[in-house]
Structures are given as C-alpha cells and as structure tokens.
C-alpha cells in the first residue's frame, strides 16, 4: 500500500484556504460598473440597495430611488427611462437559460413619488426595455410584442404570431441565445426611439428534447425544448422593422436578407442601428465561413426598407470559420456610413480595420502578432479598443485609444503602466461620447475599478477597491500563480501553473489539469481567482496546471483554426504534450497526475484519460459533450461541418467519447451530469455511462437531480464539490 | 441646503409667450441637470423638459418645440421659454432637479393659458 500523504504548509501564521471558505463564497470580489445616464452622470445600486445618482462634476450624489420603495415590491433590479420620469423595478425574477429569465415589473413616477397605476404591464414579462429616447415602453409577453407609448397607457400589440415553442418574437429560441446572439432579448430600438426592429423565430419544425424534471410531485414533469442538434432543421428567422409612433397605421415591414445569404440555410447574426434611418444586419451561412454585413435604409416613400447590394460586406474565412466565437459587429463613425470591425488580416491575426465603401479597400488600423479583442467607443476624435498586445502575453487584456482625428493615428495604451503588478487584465464601461470612462481590472491582483477623465485618462476616484477581501485575505496562505509558455516542436503553449505555498522545486507533488480548451476559449488569463483549485493546491498541496492549447483564442488562426473540422485531436494532444513537460520540470509526481473538466472540459478531460498514454491515474469530467452529434447546430456545425456522409460524418463518429470506452479501464473516472441540462443533455453522460457498462468498464458517477448545465444550486454544488475533491484526495492517497 | 424659487407665470392669451425662471438659493452647480415639470390640479406631475450639466435638451413630446429650456450659470439660474401657448398648457410650473428629489419641489410658478 501507498502511505497516505498528507502537505502540511510550513510553520506560518497563515492558514491556508479551506473548502469552506471555497463553499461559502468568503473571498469573492466586488466590481463596479457605472450605469451611465449622461456625459457625466451615472447611477449605481448601493449595497444597501438604494438608487444613488452621481454627478462626477460636482461630485454629488443623491438617492433617486429609496431601499424602501424598492423593498415595498421585492425588487432586485431597475431601469431608469431617458427622460428620467419613471424608473421599472425588476422582481420575481425566474431563470430560465443561460441568460433567460421573466420576471415582474412595476412602473414607479419619481415626479410623483408613486407607482404608476393602471394599465399594469402583464407578468410575467420576458423583456422589458425603454425606448432610448422619452419613456416609451417595449415588452415582450407570451413571445408576442408589445408597446406603450408611456407607461400609464394601454399597450399596443405588435406581433399575434407568437406561441410557446413554436414562434418567438423579440426574444431569441433556445439555439439563438446560447449560440448567437448572447442576449435573452431580440429587439433593437432606433437611437430616436421611433422604429423598433425585431427578430421572428419559427421553431415550428425544430425536433424537440424532452426530459424529466422530478420536482416533488408524483409524476415528473417533462420538459420540451426546440433544440436543433448538429444537422437537423434549423429555426426559420426574419426580421421586421415597426414605427413605433404609428405602429397601427403600416404594421411592421420584413427587412430583406441579401440574396447570397437567402440561397441556402442561414443565420441572423447581430442587428446594429447605425442612425435614425439606417439599420446595419449581419447575416451568416449555415456553413459558418462566409457573413454578410448588409447596411438597409428607409424609404419614406415606399414605407419600406432597402438593403442595395452596394452596401453588403462579405466576409469570408478560407481556414475556418468566420470570426471568433461570434462574427464581430460594426462600430460605425459619425458620418454613419464608414465603420470599424474587427476580422483577420493576411497573417491571420484579428485586427481592427476600417471600411469606407468595400471590405477590399479596407484599411488595417492595427496590426501585429497579437489580436485586437474588442471595439469599445469610437468617437469623432479617439477609438478605444481592447487587445493583448502589451508585452506579448495572449493572456491580458489593456485599453488603447487611437486618435483618429490625426494622421497617422496615433496608439496610447491607456491601461498599461497604471497598476502594472496588480493589473493586467481590463475591461472598461465609456459614457455616451467617451468623456468619462469607468476601468474594471480583473487581476492578477485583487480586482480594483476606478473612474477616468476620458479626454486625458487621469484617474478622478477609485470606485472598488476590495478592500475587505484585501483584509480577509492577509491570513491566508494563498497559492503562487506564474504564468509561462513552454515550446513543443514548432508549437508555443501558454500556461499557467498554481504552486502549493512553500513550493519547493527539488520535493514532487501531485499534478491536477485544469482544462477547457474549447474553440475560442482562452483558460490561462491574467485574472484574480480564489476557487476550488485555488484551495486544493492552498490546503492539499496540489500543483494546478491550465494549458491553452491550440483551437483556443487570441493567437492567430493558425494556432485557432487547427481544430477546424477534427475536433477532440488536437486538443487533446497538446493536454498529453504540456504534461510531459510539467514532469519534465523535476517535481511532479508521475503515479499522482489528475484531469478535470466541464462542459467542453470534460469532453477533452474524457478523452485525455482514454488517450491510452498512462499519463493521467484518474480523472473527471462533469457534464461533459461526448458525441457532436448531440450537441447544438450553430456551435458544432460551426467547427465540425454536417454530420453528412459527403461532409464530415466519419469525424463526427470517431470523436465520440463512447468510441474510446475500452481505454478507460486503467484509468479512475467520475463522471458528473446534472440530469435538467438544457444545454449539454444528459444524454451525453448516458451514452458514456452505457458504452462503459458494454466495455465492463468500471467507473464512478454521480447525477445531480433537476440541475441544469451549471449545477449551482448551493446544496448541489457543495455535494459536488465535496465529492469531487473525496475522489481527488483518494486518487492522490491525501488523508482527510 | 438648496432652495429652489420659481417665478415669472401668469396669466396670457392663446399663441402667447411667457418666460419662467428658477433661481437656486444656495450652491448649483452648473454641472447639475435641471428640469422643469408641469401639473394640472388633479393630475400627475410630468416632464415639461430637462437639461444636463453637458448642456443636452430632453423635451416632452407634447412641447412640439414651442418651449426652450436655458441657464445661466453665473445666475444660478433656470428658464423656459413658452411660445405658442395653448390652453392645455394651463398648469403650475415647477423646477427641480432631472431626475427629481422629492424634498426639493418648491410652490411653482402658476401659467394660465385662456382668452
């Protein structure tokens, strides 16, 4: 038998992480984003839960919206109308997807200090939102539209055709929120608030997933969803432009879809106003490497809206797909015509470019072996952008701002040397036309937001500091994070490595992989984290490693584009490969070396330990995808091509985790599935669990009950927590 | 503590004009965003139009640019112009700050629109 082992951190004051402390949320941080309402006003929902108004001038603030008026309808959330006359309280809020939920709202008038009554808007709601301009009401019910032209008015019904699981107006299906647009809403006002576009999806033809939900009634409820899986029918989209001032008088008009687009199956992919007449629609093929941006304007004359050939950008990937996980949108400048959009250059690395009339003549504003991430503000005078370029790490994100008034634009990096230790990682929240500008840094050092002048990037006020979490955390013994690249053949890996406190470089460990390594993802991030890996190598003495293999994002497509077409090789491949270095380095324990991953994690995890290498003694994979048959259209088609004999079939069935059945039985392996995954079905988890039996295979599992893809429930993620470091800690004969 | 005073109603015929004011006593900044409001007896109180510190305009819908709302920092001071004054237009007028504070609505400045 093998001595249990137990890591005792050194004599220290310090204690370390417990799974407790993991468990409670005790070293969570705070982060601030102003909810800009002017050029230099913003309002803020303050801990105890009043509505606080700020002027960054004259450095006032005052409550709007009383803890007690929103106590008085249980509200957590709120929306101020532009015209500041009436604010929505949010309440009841019920989850249904990834970013789904209804809800009640209440209209509450701050000029007279009541609720509006009268007219109360139906519950519950799916999407509520406020024109951008007065106090006009948008709202979707039963996935019908509706508008009220102030909030005390009676509704006007837009849309009829709405029915549950069929057709869904102004609000994305299942496939379209998760896959495409990101959002639980499907509807765009104007910037003068008098047009409303839209998206119709028809589902009518989608096959449907059906599971149980137990519940705690006699029989289980079942649930069904229009879920399009890799080659099946697809939803049926259109888009409609209404005039929200007359809205009876025409009805909503159909926005043509560019006739290359129409000619076989197709996705609507974004929806961009560009001014009060100009709508910008991007759409894409089903074979997700050619997206059209097509500009429309209205007609007066023929109450219509025209899309002239002239004003449709194709862009086309010949390596994979197009864009990133998503096609970038188009941030257009003042003249409304030209725009800046983030695609790949001729080296295949994605840039900023600027289009005047053709993607041909488009000119390249960035350019680099690094990859410009986002687009935040353009304004007549300076364009801010997010990328990875400061001193070539793909792991951190920094600001930059490009005068484009001058010739050549000139590039400051705005974020770089402002707290160069602490932070690395920034996303950043601008006021209408820039003037102010809120930095959010992620890490590495504890999060911190500050508020900025955004004519000369001073600092004006720190918002968040964290500094409770900063007091919290002097006691504890936290592990040493590094983050570096290791070189395999032609190949760069970065990764990053979490050390036991005390690490001693001539002792061994036990080694856990951390991995996701999903296309376009991106693991090893300049990024503060206290988690449950955080804990392991804090307490049990456990070394973390996160490899960004290829398929993952931000270094070029060579490196992204790799896994196009043969997903669950390479990924998988680079996993094997970083491991053999990391014993390499001297102090990693061979027999003790674990995997662990969810989602697309547990796919690789899945695969890594059925790699027949005798790398890895044990692993898990929680709600893992095991076959891409299974999984959405948008996302595996995306990477994977058709399931079709003359397409991509043969790699579709010899990428299955149930292929490998066979190489599992030298390894240990927990596998975890929530059985109300509405994303990755438990199905997954099934077949594993059924081509294991059929191997004799023996393995470990554990279903959590009526949990969906993200099992967060607290009892449940306690449980599956607490189970998985058991296995971990016998895996790696660590005492309890 | 700021104390919001408005003056300058009264009453005029159809198509006329007035020009309302509201003076801070007290600090304003001006950076704060101002507005002025309108009720009719029995009715809620609405936004007639709004201005920030930045100098953007909000005007109701109704407004249908016949009112113009200004300041004069050096004044601490708020107006609106009213032209083409209708008899729907009849209502007390009053100043406070965009979005309002409810301790800070003063007695209004009444306008009586009537031939």
């Known amino acids: 038998l093998r001595p249990s082992r137990v890591y005792k951190p050194e004599g220290n004051t310090k204690r370390a992480l417990t799974l407790k402390d993991i468990l409670n949320g005790t070293f969570s941080y705070k982060t601030y984003f102003p909810n800009w309402i002017s050029e230099q006003e913003y309002l803020h929902q303050s801990e105890d839960d009043n509505i606080v108004f700020y002027n960054i001038e004259t450095r006032e603030s005052y409550i709007i919206l009383s803890n007690s008026t929103m106590k008085s309808v249980n509200a957590t959330d709120y929306g101020l109308s532009p015209d500041r006359q009436f604010v929505y309280l949010e309440s009841d809020y019920s989850k249904l997807w990834r970013y789904s939920y209804t809800a009640t709202y209440y209209i509450y008038d701050l000029q007279n200090g009541e609720f509006v009554r009268g007219y109360e808007l139906p519950r519950p709601i799916q999407y509520l939102c406020w024109s951008p301009v007065g106090s006009k009401l948008a709202y979707v019910y039963q996935n019908n539209i509706y508008l009220k032209q102030r909030p005390g008015d009676p509704p006007f019904q837009i849309t009829y055709t709405g029915r549950e699981n069929r057709i869904f107006n102004g609000i994305p299906d299942w496939v379209y929120e998760e896959e495409m647009l990101a959002t639980k809403y499907a509807l765009w006002w104007s910037p003068d608030g008098k047009f409303l576009a839209y998206v119709e999806f028809n589902d009518s033809d989608i096959p449907i997933i059906a599971y149980s939900y137990y519940g705690d009634g006699q029989y289980p409820r079942t649930i069904n969803i229009p879920y399009p899986k890799a080659g099946a029918k697809n939803p049926v989209v259109r888009v409609f432009i209404v005039d929200t001032t007359y809205p009876h008088h025409v009805g909503p008009m159909e926005v043509p879809v560019p006739e290359m687009i129409a000619s076989s199956d197709y996705y609507f992919s974004w929806l961009t106003w560009v001014s009060s007449e100009r709508v910008c629609l991007q759409w894409l093929k089903r074979v997700q490497n050619v997206s059209v941006l097509s500009i429309c304007d209205f007609r007066e004359d023929w109450h219509a809206w025209e899309c002239p050939k002239n004003q449709e950008h194709v862009e086309e990937s010949r390596t994979g797909w197009a864009g990133g996980f998503f096609v970038s949108t188009p941030a257009f400048s003042q003249d409304a015509t030209s725009y800046y959009k983030i695609f790949s250059d001729k080296d295949g690395y994605k840039h900023i470019h600027y289009i005047k009339d053709t993607v041909e003549n488009a000119i390249q504003i960035t350019s680099g072996k690094w990859e410009a991430i986002y687009i935040f503000r353009v304004t007549q005078d300076s364009l801010f952008y997010s990328s990875n370029e400061f001193e070539g790490y793909p792991g951190r994100r920094n600001i930059y701002r490009i005068s484009i008034g001058n010739s050549p634009p000139s590039k400051k990096c705005v974020t770089c040397h402002l707290r160069k230790e602490r932070c690395q990682y920034y996303t950043a929240s601008f006021s209408y036309k820039a003037k102010y500008y809120a930095l959010v840094c992620y890490g590495p050092g504890l999060p911190i937001s500050t508020l900025h002048d955004g004519r000369t990037d001073q600092e004006i006020q720190v918002l968040e500091e964290n500094k409770e979490l900063e007091n919290s955390l002097r006691n504890i013994q936290l592990p040493k994070v590094e983050i570096k690249k290791l070189k395999d053949g032609g190949l760069t890996f970065w990764y990053k490595m979490i050390l036991p406190p005390q690490f001693d470089r001539s002792k061994k460990y036990p080694l856990l992989i951390q991995v996701y390594g999903g296309p376009c993802s991106q693991s090893v991030k300049s990024v503060f984290a206290v988690n449950w890996i955080t804990y392991l190598a804090s307490k049990e003495g456990i070394v973390i490693a996160l490899v960004d293999g290829r398929g993952t994002a931000f270094q070029g497509d060579k490196f992204l584009h790799a896994v196009y077409r043969k997903l669950g090789v390479y990924e998988v491949e680079d996993q094997l490969t970083a491991v053999r270095k990391f014993i390499e380095m001297g102090f990693i324990d061979e027999e003790r070396i674990a995997i662990w991953g969810w989602s697309y994690g547990g796919y690789v995890s899945s695969l890594a330990l059925a790699s027949g290498t005798g790398l890895f003694k044990c692993g898990i994979a929680v709600a893992p995808v095991s076959s891409w048959e299974y999984y959405a259209s948008i996302y595996s088609e995306r990477f994977m091509g058709l399931p079709t004999k003359d397409d991509n079939l043969e790699h579709y069935k010899n990428s299955t985790v149930m292929a490998r059945a066979e190489y599992f039985r030298n390894v240990d392996y927990l596998l975890i599935h929530g059985t109300a995954d509405d994303n990755v079905h438990f199905q997954n988890s099934a077949q594993i669990a059924k081509a294991l039996v059929n191997a004799q295979v023996d393995f470990q599992a554990m279903w959590y009950s009526d949990q969906n893809h993200g099992i967060s429930s607290g009892r449940s993620q306690n449980h599956l927590y607490t189970h998985m470091t058991h296995f971990l800690k016998q895996c790696f004969s660590l005492s309890d | 503590d700021v104390q919001l005073v408005e003056s300058g109603g009264g009453l005029v015929q159809p198509g006329g004009s007035l020009r309302l004011s509201c003076v801070a006593s007290?600090?304003?900044?001006?950076?704060?965003?101002m507005a002025w409001y309108r009720q009719v007896p029995g009715k809620r109180r609405e936004l007639v139009a709004g201005?920030?510190?930045?100098?953007?305009?909000n005007y109701a819908d109704f407004v249908g640019g016949r009112f113009t709302i200004s300041r004069d920092n050096a004044k601490n001071g708020l107006y609106l112009q009213l032209n083409g004054l209708k008899p729907e237009d009849t209502a007390a007028y009053y100043c406070?700050?965009?979005?309002?504070?409810?301790?800070?609505w003063g007695q209004g400045t009444q306008v009586t629109v009537s031939s």
């Open positions: 406070n700050f965009w979005p309002p504070l409810i301790n800070y």
């Open positions: 007290g600090r304003l900044s001006s950076s704060n965003s």
């Open positions: 201005i920030t510190g930045g100098g953007e305009t």
